[in-house]
Interface confidence: low
């Protein structure tokens, strides 16, 4: 950055160069530049030369006052108008940064996703605190008092093979930036209490004809667990309101749920799980479309594509459709 | 109206000092970020930057002439000084004096300093 | 020192022409680059200042350019009385150097 230049001189910021967003701030610019009394001191941030609120102070230095700074990052330098150089002369530069300390992290989740062989953990870190933060995830064994720290600038990974001292921790977070420190509550955690089952999958769907035509959502999990329990929601895409069905669930075979959809409407499902009883559920699985065929049933292809119908002789009306969705906010 | 005048010896033998004078009018030395520069000519050739000396009498050499060199300056009477001493046949030539002044290059821009008026130049020749 | 190369030498030329010399410094200067114009027997005067800037009464047909290393004037409509020698100066940093100049001559 600009703080690699060689300097000339001296540049420094008061409250400091990391400040918190909004303050009132003062760059003091300071020439040494041999045989150089300067004619006039320039400011440039961004290398944008600054017109305005600079203060001579002596013969060889200036201050520029900004009032209010709202920018997250400024790249600031000075110069000296030295007669003798014939050219402006770079005295030297800095990099200052505004933002905001650390909130107190909350909402602190630990879970293993099967397979994964890993304990993540997250946190809400609160608002965006613009400069570097930085947060130390702290996990103390219950049984064996041991404590460790992992360094991080979001979320963690940890090792479950790291995880030593019994079943039993307590975790919190701690996080700190150069304008202030947080820590969160702390979390009492059971590691069998928090295994977040392997995802289930919706794989098709299809409309059998019937007196009362019924679809069939077939879906499945690659998970070990024995007792699970499971969500799926269903609404028409038109809809704004979801539809809820609980399982309890053995994922021995592929599972086939029954529902009864009103004719030649766009469904959309989702399937969700968790080990009975547990804490965490998955995060809803990816959207998974199914048109229902009107009275005579139909055929439907691969959804978000344009639907194509084929003759009115089929059986069953047969859905692959899936579209990924972002999954926010599921766990919990 | 800025004006500058050079005077010097006209002919000068071998080993001898060559002392110039310029003397100006329109500006002044003791003005902050003035200054006065020598520059010199061979007779069809190009344009050699000797010396300058500044407001506040710092002074600036050529490297490849600095040890014979001697720029000095007489603000009150508005005039500047060039000796060049064991002097050759090689510094025959015209001298020039000229001034260097800031120009304005808008409010968001430092000045820029230019050589910009020149006297008319004093011819010298060196030989024995 | 900062070598200042000038090219061409010397240029035959028709009134009215459009000419172009260069100045190629040995070394980055910035914009830090002057033209000055020399009549046979007279004292050199600047036409352009700092690459690009016209100093005060400098007929707008004579233009400058470039930065960094590489240097352009331009005469637009070339006149009788612009026969002259031109030189570029840097002034980036001591010592001052000059071009060996461009002798205008009519073809």
């Known amino acids: 950055g600009i703080t690699n230049i060689n300097c000339s001189g001296h540049i420094w910021v008061e409250p400091a160069t990391i400040f918190k967003m909004g303050m009132n701030i003062s760059i003091y610019c300071q020439a040494a530049i041999k045989n150089c009394q300067p004619r006039k001191l320039h400011f440039y941030k961004n290398g944008i030369k600054e017109r305005f609120q600079i203060t001579r102070i002596n013969k060889t230095t200036a201050r520029l006052w900004y009032k209010n700074f709202l920018e997250p990052h400024a790249s600031m330098y000075c110069t000296a108008e030295c007669p003798k150089h014939f050219q402006e002369t770079l005295i030297c530069g800095k990099d200052i940064s505004s933002g905001y300390p650390p909130d107190i992290p909350d909402e602190v989740t630990c879970v293993i996703y099967e397979y994964s062989g890993n304990m993540t953990c997250t946190w809400n870190a609160g608002k965006l605190t613009y400069i570097d933060t930085k947060y130390v995830v702290h996990v103390k064994s219950l049984e064996t008092e041991e404590e460790q720290q992992y360094l991080t600038s979001s979320y963690i990974n940890i090792s479950t093979d790291s995880l030593q001292g019994g079943k039993k921790y307590l975790v919190w977070v701690q996080a700190a930036n150069a304008l202030g420190m947080e820590e969160s509550k702390q979390l009492q955690i059971h590691l069998d209490d928090i295994v977040i089952p392997s995802a289930a999958v919706i794989s098709r769907a299809e409309t059998i004809n019937a007196t009362v035509p019924k679809t069939i959502i077939y879906w499945d999990s690659q998970t070990t667990i024995e007792k699970v329990s499971c969500e799926m929601r269903y609404k028409a895409t038109t809809n704004q309101t979801w539809n809820v069905k609980e399982f309890d669930t053995n994922f021995t075979y592929v599972q086939q749920s029954e529902f009864y959809l009103e004719p030649n409407i766009k469904y959309v499902f989702q399937v969700r799980c968790q080990e009975t009883g547990k804490r965490y559920w998955q995060p809803w699985s990816s959207l998974f479309f199914h048109k229902t065929p009107e009275t005579v049933p139909q055929v439907t292809s691969k959804a978000f594509q344009h639907d194509t119908w084929n003759s009115g002789l089929t059986v069953a009306s047969i859905s692959t459709g899936h579209l990924t969705s972002d999954n926010r906010g599921d766990i919990g | 109206q800025v004006t500058l005048k050079e005077s010097g010896p006209g002919i000068l033998q071998p080993s001898q000092t060559l002392s110039l004078t310029c003397t100006f009018s329109?500006?002044?030395?003791?003005?902050?970020?003035?200054?006065v520069g020598w520059i010199r000519q061979p007779s069809g050739k190009g344009l050699e930057w000797l010396a300058n000396?500044?407001?506040?009498?710092?002074?600036y050499y050529n490297p490849s002439l600095k040890n014979r060199l001697t720029i000095s300056k007489d603000t009150s009477n508005n005039q500047a000084f060039l000796k060049i001493t064991n002097v050759d046949t090689a510094d025959t030539a015209t001298y020039y004096c000229?001034?260097?002044?800031?120009?304005?290059?808008?409010?968001?821009?430092?000045?820029?300093?230019?050589?910009?008026?020149w006297g008319q130049g004093a011819s010298v020749t060196v030989s024995s | 020192d900062i070598v200042m190369t000038q090219s061409p030498t010397s240029m035959s030329i028709s009134l009215g022409d459009r000419v172009t010399m260069n100045c190629k410094a040995s070394?980055?200067?910035?914009?830090?680059v002057d033209w000055y114009q020399q009549k046979t027997g007279q004292s050199p005067k600047l036409l352009i200042y700092?690459?690009?800037n016209r100093y005060t009464g400098v007929p707008d047909r004579f233009t400058g350019s470039g930065s960094g290393t590489d240097f352009t004037f331009t005469i637009s409509n070339m006149q009788a009385e612009d026969l002259s020698v031109y030189y570029c100066?840097?002034?980036?940093?001591?010592?001052?150097?000059f071009g060996s100049g461009t002798k205008l001559e009519i073809k």
């Open positions: 000229a001034r260097i002044d800031a120009h304005p290059m808008g409010i968001t821009t430092p000045d820029y300093y230019v050589v910009d008026a």
């Open positions: 329109g500006f002044s030395l003791s003005t902050y970020g003035m200054g």
């Open positions: 000396i500044w407001w506040d009498d710092d002074k």
């Open positions: 070394q980055n200067v910035g914009s830090n």
């Open positions: 700092k690459a690009s």
């Open positions: 100066m840097q002034s980036n940093s001591y010592p001052l150097t």
